[in-house]
């Protein structure tokens, strides 16, 4: 496999990761697909320092991250352990609110205008952030 040693054009390097910040909105699943198409993933926040970095770049705008509970428990898209990891929920969140009238609850996490997290309907067209790690060998699956 090949190893990425510097960030692609229009991505921002920070602490050996590359970040791409959207300026348009998409549903969570579509944002997730677009990140994966770039061999990246929706941003996984593992520390207060990373939270501050992302918050600085997105400003006071609802923005998807790589955290969801669509299959039951909350999970980070890269497999980072949710229970023992960094969290920055707003008070009373996540609440899986059903009162929005859109059907179902709230299964996808986003940064709110103050940076703290909220769960919301995954179909909402929010901005998103992709992240990929530097020095990580990109696995090219063997051809059959």
């Amino acid at each position: 496999g090949s190893e990425r040693t510097c960030c692609p054009v229009n991505w921002v390097e920070h602490e050996r990761s590359c970040y791409w910040f959207s300026r348009s909105g998409k549903a969570w699943a579509d944002a997730d697909n677009y990140c994966r198409l770039e061999d990246a993933h929706l941003v996984v926040v593992t520390s207060w320092e990373e939270q501050k970095f992302v918050q600085h770049h997105i400003g006071p705008v609802n923005t998807w991250m790589g955290l969801h509970d669509q299959n039951g428990p909350w999970k980070w898209v890269d497999g980072t352990d949710y229970e023992t990891g960094f969290k920055n929920w707003r008070p009373e969140q996540p609440d899986d609110w059903y009162g929005h009238g859109l059907g179902g609850g709230e299964d996808c996490a986003h940064f709110t205008d103050d940076g703290r997290w909220n769960d919301d309907v995954c179909q909402r067209p929010y901005r998103w952030v992709c992240e990929t790690e530097l020095d990580k060998a990109s696995q090219e699956p063997p051809l059959l």
């Epitope: 090949s2 348009s24 579509d30 198409l37 770039e38 990109s138 090219e140 699956p141």
Partner: antibody, heavy 121, light 107 residues
Framework: EVQLLESGGGLVQPGGSLRLSCAAS????????MSWVRQAPGKGLEWVSA????????FYADSVKGRFTISRDNSKNTLYLQMNSLRAEDTAVYYC??????????????WGQGTLVTVSS | EIVMTQSPAILSVFPGERATLSCRAS??????LAWYQQKPGQAPRLLIY???TRATGMPARFSGGGSGTEFTLTISSLQSEHFAVYYC?????????FGPGTKVDIK
């Protein structure tokens, strides 16, 4: 100059298999996501499958999921589409297409000339 | 999935005239829309992306407009090389979907 050259099409019986190839040149192949788009005779365009630059992430239309497999060999600058359990409705010209190259912009700026797949008994 | 429709199916135009093609999405795709031109026996060619941005090398006579669910492609002065089929494509939502096409032919 960007060039995409498909091969591997032909006549195959229903239930049969075929592997399409797309040889790429004129750009840094491993840096771009790639896709297959098909066009049934006299019909419109249908997105079939996509793959990330490293080959680590793949995406499929529901109509081909579980039957088609997209892959790539970046050392050979080649994109593949393995097609199994072929049906009459898979008959089409299959185009290899390069993604535009901007995150979140899922359109295709270069296309191959296409290879015809005919599924018939 | 998002369904794209195009109208008219066939547009007959005199050379030198302006042609306006329409594309509609079944739900909002913001500005995530592309237009392609396809001539018989050839692959599609990207004309417009982002609803209104011309692709590299595309002449100014091609212009795109609209956002949300309603889009247009305008060809300001049709020349013989512009008689072809034109497709719109949305890339806001996966899977990506194309319209059925508008055939522009000579009147």
């Amino acid at each position: 100059e960007v060039q995409l050259l498909e091969s591997g099409g032909g006549l195959v019986q229903p239930g049969g298999s075929l592997r399409l190839s797309c040889a790429a040149s004129g750009f840094t192949f491993s840096s771009y996501a790639m896709s297959w788009v098909r066009q049934a005779p006299g019909k419109g365009l249908e997105w079939v499958s996509a793959i990330s630059g490293s080959g680590g992430n793949t995406f499929y239309a529901d109509s081909v999921k579980g039957r088609f497999t997209i892959s790539r060999d970046n050392s050979k600058n080649t994109l593949y589409l393995q097609m199994n359990s072929l049906r009459a409705e898979d008959t089409a010209v299959y185009y290899c297409a390069k993604f535009f190259g901007v995150v979140g912009v899922g359109c295709f700026d270069y296309w191959g000339q296409g290879t015809l797949v005919t599924v018939s008994s | 999935e998002i369904v794209m429709t195009q109208s008219p199916a066939i547009l007959s135009v005199f050379p030198g005239e302006r042609a306006t093609l329409s594309c509609r999405a079944s739900q909002s795709v913001s500005s995530d829309l592309a237009w392609y031109q396809q001539k018989p026996g050839q692959a599609p060619r990207l004309l417009i992306y982002g609803a209104s941005t011309r692709a590299t090398g595309m002449p100014a006579r091609f212009s795109g407009g609209g956002s949300g669910t309603e889009f247009t492609l305008t060809i300001s002065s049709l020349q013989s090389e512009h008689f072809a089929v034109y497709y719109c494509q949305q890339y806001s939502n996966w899977p990506f979907t194309f319209g059925p096409g508008t055939k522009v032919d000579i009147k």
